[in-house]
Each structure stands twice: as structure tokens, then as C-alpha cells.
Interface confidence: low
Amino acid sequence: EEELQVIQPDKSVSVAAGESAILHCTVTSLIPVGPIQWFRGAGPARELIYNQKEGHFPRVTTVSESTKRENMDFSISISNITPADAGTYYCVKFRKGSPDTEFKSGAGTELSVRGKPSAPVVSGPAARATPQHTVSFTCESHGFSPRDITLKWFKNGNELSDFQTNVDPVGESVSYSIHSTAKVVLTREDVHSQVICEVAHVTLQGDPLRGTANLSETIRVPPTLEVTQQPVRAENQVNVTCQVRKFYPQRLQLTWLENGNVSRTETASTVTENKDGTYNWMSWLLVNVSAHRDDVKLTCQVEHDGQPAVSKSHDLKVSAHPKEQGSNTAAENTGSNERNIY
């Protein structure tokens, strides 16, 4: 009678992580009597995957009814494959004895695992930057296999070209990581913008993974200041307004100075939001001109988001106004137009 052969028809099998891998194995004879075992790897360090005779292998199921005496199909299915399962699997026939002895091995089936990349994580610069500056964003994704992967950067749907990408390790590995750095030029309109890192891989079936970063966490749009003077009904009073426009983020402190002396300091609270995400705010100062003998230099000084203060001055001519003794400068609270943006 012809000697038993162990046939592993598949030289290689590729499976996506999380799926099941079927490893085929048939024998050509029922003789000699003895169990089949599956191993990963060869030699003394090989790892037992399945023993037909004994043991508990919760991830392994037999494809055919291997308990039948006449069964010659010893194919197995391994569930919930991970990159760590990659390797060469051998179907080995043992001869019954005390102990059982190895009789013949199949040629082996190499299992490669298509690992899905992890959700890309995008991180931006530690400190805010102003429009026209270039900032760097990094994108990282891990755990994918095979090594081939495509990474793209977008800003508001527009693809970016200024980026560098590395895939590690360079050599063979059960799984890989990708790291990319993109350079983005900020504009004043970027408060609502997003930077998106998109990763495409064979395991994703054409549905790429995306990681995002909101430029609202990166950008600082410095305010523009305008100081104007409006007449008021009371003939000795002048209303001076400081319009603080198009700033982001909201953190802002305003100080009024009269001839270089601090008159009032206030913090922007009730602001108006523009469609582009920046804010406007208005503060006013009600000045009793009769309290001043000479012209007054009024300065609106703004410290935005911890940056050096910027200021705008306005010269208030008081010579034309009648003087009244004993009158002090009066300063009202902040004025603002409060509204929600919908």
C-alpha cells in the first residue's frame, strides 16, 4: 500500500485581522493510525496550535467531521486572527504509540495577516500660530499589514502636497506603523477649517480611515482695532468706542488709557461671532470733557491670548468744550452686541 502523504495545498493564505483563517490539510491514507497535530513554525521551538487527540484550543475548529474514523481531512479554522498569528503552519501526522511519534509533515502554509491600520491620530503644534505662518501637523497610524499603505492630507477637502511620510520598520514585520508630517499655511479664515489625514489600506475595502484636527485649536487671529468718537446728547460728554474685530480665540483683555493713565480694564465676555468663527467686540468710554483742561489722548490697549498688547489711540480735542470744575471722568461698562450665530 502507498505510503501516507500529508498534503497542504496552499503555499500561502492571507487573512484580514479579526477574520478567520482556514488552513487546509488532507492525508492520503488511514494508515498508520495516529493523531494529526498543527504547529506554527518548525524545529524544537515550534508552537502547538491544535492537537486532534487532546487539549483545549478555543480559537481552532475543524473544518470537517474529524472524529469520524475514516476522515482524511484535517483542515482547521483559526478565529479572530491578529498580526501575531502570522507565520508558517505545518500539518503533522503522528504514529500512535507511547508516546506518539512524528511520522510525516506537510510542506507548510504561510499565513500572512492583513492588519487594519488604527484610526489615524492627528496632532498639531503645541502653541498657537497666526495667519500666514506655516504650522506642522503629525498623523500616526499603527498595526497594519501588509506594509503598502497610502496616506493623504486634506485641508477643508483640498488635498495638501507638502508632507513627509515614513513607514516603520523598514524590514519584515508582523505589523507596521506610519508617521507623516504635513505643513499647513494658516489663513485668517481657518478658524472653522479642519486638517484631515486619510489612510487607505487594502484591509479597508476602499473606505479610508480619517483623523482630523480642528485649526481652531491651532490658530490665533490677532484683532484689528478702531477707535472712534461719537457725540452724545449731554454737551459735556463724548462717547469713545473701541471696535475690536476679527480675533480668535476669545481670550482678550482691553485697557483704556487716558493720557497714559489706566482708566479701566475689562475682559471680553459677550462677543459677536462672525461667520468665519472669529469674534468682534466693542468697548466704549464715556468721557466728561469738562474734567479736562487740555486735549486728551485716549488709548485702547488690547492684550489678546497672552500676546504683547496692541493699541490704538484717539486724540480728543477739549478746547471747544465749556469747562466745569469738580467733574470727574466717568467710564461706563463694556458695550457689546450679543447674538447667537445660527
Epitope: 477643508n156 477637502g157 477649517s193 482630523t212 461667520k275
Partner: antibody, heavy 120, light 107 residues
Framework: QVQLVESGGGVVQPGRSLRLSCAAS????????MIWVRQAPGKGLEWVAS????????YYADSVKGRFTISRDNSKNRLYLQMNSLRAEDTAVYYC?????????????WGQGTMVTVSS | DTQLTQSPSSLSASVGQRVTITCGAS??????MHWYQQKPGKQPKLLIY???NLEAGVPSRFSGSGSGTDFTLTISSLQPEDFATYYC?????????FGQGTKLEIK
């Protein structure tokens, strides 16, 4: 899989209120912007309101501004639409939808809709 | 507000035919135009996003093009399941307006 299920529709008299709810599952609700869109019988789609993932940004159509309020509870994976001072022209199927990523992105998943009828 | 005008409002076509629907915007919406399909009694389904990107799971016979104010949805070879109403929608700025719809009927 992603699921959005609207509820709370019904028949209501003009001037009265109704609160719609949208239960989300199958995705990380707190990562996504959400939208209400309506469709009057035999008519086209009309965007009603949007809310960002953290509720920081809320927008309304002019036709509902001041009467409708969109809100969300990320701990319960729910989106709401409080509709006050209802009018006959608010009669429509109301859909909740998910907006992936930023402001400029489309509505990639929609609920099956809930019917609101405003009639005396 | 950005007005969207779809053309035609309705269209009769045969299976296998190539069909084009256009959407014009009253001002530039850059590439932030999306296309949806809606069948009677059902919720809308996203087909094309950001002018030309095919949504996952949508057959490749659907394609989109355009930028600025003029956009096109093309179905290269009509299938029986494609008879529905199609809407364009802009997300360049709120309010996020829809076109009035194009009803595609079987000839």
C-alpha cells in the same frame, strides 16, 4: 452599523409645541455633528438646523429661527429638536442625519424620519 | 443664502441610458457640493460628496464633477434601481441649502 432612529412626531395644533428625538447607535456620537432636515409632503428637502459635536456651533434655517431649538446629549447618544409655536407650514417628515468631520462635509447617514402634522 | 437650481426638474430615461443632472449655485460653493438619492417613502442616501468623491458602497456608474457654481451628477448606464429623486446640497456655508430635486422616471 450606524443607526439613527427619530421619534416624537405626531399631530399637533398650530401654536403648540413638540419635541423630536433621535437615538444614535453604531458610532461614537460625540465625535459627529448632527443635523435636522425636513421634507414637506410632495416637496423637496429643507435643512432645518445643525449642531456641532460639542454643541459649540449651532445654526438654524431662517424659517425656524427663534421657534426651534436643536440640542444634544452626548451621554445618552441623543439629538433633539424642540419645536415651539408650530405652524401649518412646519408639516413635514423630519429626518435626523449625521455629518462626518467638519462643517463642509455632507450628511452621510440619515434616519428613517418621523412625521409631524400641524393642523387645527 | 446660496440658492441651488437643479436641471432638469424631471427626466424620463431608459435602462442602460446615460443620464446627466446639473446643479447651479447662485454663488461659489468651492467643491462643497454633495449629491443624494431618495426613493419614495425612504430617507435620502449619500452618493457623491465634495463634488466628485464616490461614497463607500455606491456603484461606480455614479460620478460627480464640477467646482465653484456648476456641478454635474452622471449615471453612466441606468439600472432599474436608479429611478428615484436626486438632490444636490451645498455645505460651503449655512444655511445648508438643497436643490429642488430631479425626479428620474422610467421611460
Amino acid at each position: 452599523q450606524v443607526q439613527l432612529v427619530e421619534s416624537g412626531g405626531g399631530v399637533v395644533q398650530p401654536g403648540r409645541s413638540l419635541r423630536l428625538s433621535c437615538a444614535a447607535s453604531g458610532f461614537t456620537f460625540s465625535d459627529y455633528g448632527m443635523i435636522w432636515v425636513r421634507q414637506a409632503p410632495g416637496k423637496g428637502l429643507e435643512w432645518v438646523a445643525s449642531i456641532s459635536s460639542s454643541s459649540s456651533y449651532i445654526y438654524y434655517a431662517d424659517s425656524v429661527k427663534g421657534r426651534f431649538t436643536i440640542s444634544r446629549d452626548n451621554s445618552k447618544n441623543r439629538l433633539y429638536l424642540q419645536m415651539n409655536s408650530l405652524r401649518a407650514e412646519d408639516t413635514a417628515v423630519y429626518y435626523c442625519a449625521r455629518r462626518y468631520y467638519g462643517f463642509n462635509y455632507p450628511f452621510d447617514y440619515w434616519g428613517q424620519g418621523t412625521m409631524v402634522t400641524v393642523s387645527s | 443664502d446660496t440658492q441651488l437650481t437643479q436641471s432638469p426638474s424631471s427626466l424620463s430615461a431608459s435602462v442602460g441610458q446615460r443620464v446627466t443632472i446639473t446643479c447651479g449655485a447662485s454663488k461659489s460653493v468651492r467643491t462643497y457640493m454633495h449629491w443624494y438619492q431618495q426613493k419614495p417613502g425612504k430617507q435620502p442616501k449619500l452618493l457623491i460628496y465634495s463634488a466628485s468623491n464616490l461614497e463607500a458602497g455606491v456603484p461606480s456608474r455614479f460620478s460627480g464633477s464640477g467646482s465653484g457654481t456648476d456641478f454635474t451628477l452622471t449615471i453612466s448606464s441606468l439600472q432599474p434601481e436608479d429611478f428615484a429623486t436626486y438632490y444636490c446640497q451645498q455645505s460651503n456655508e449655512p444655511p445648508y441649502t438643497f436643490g429642488q430635486g430631479t425626479k428620474l422616471e422610467i421611460k
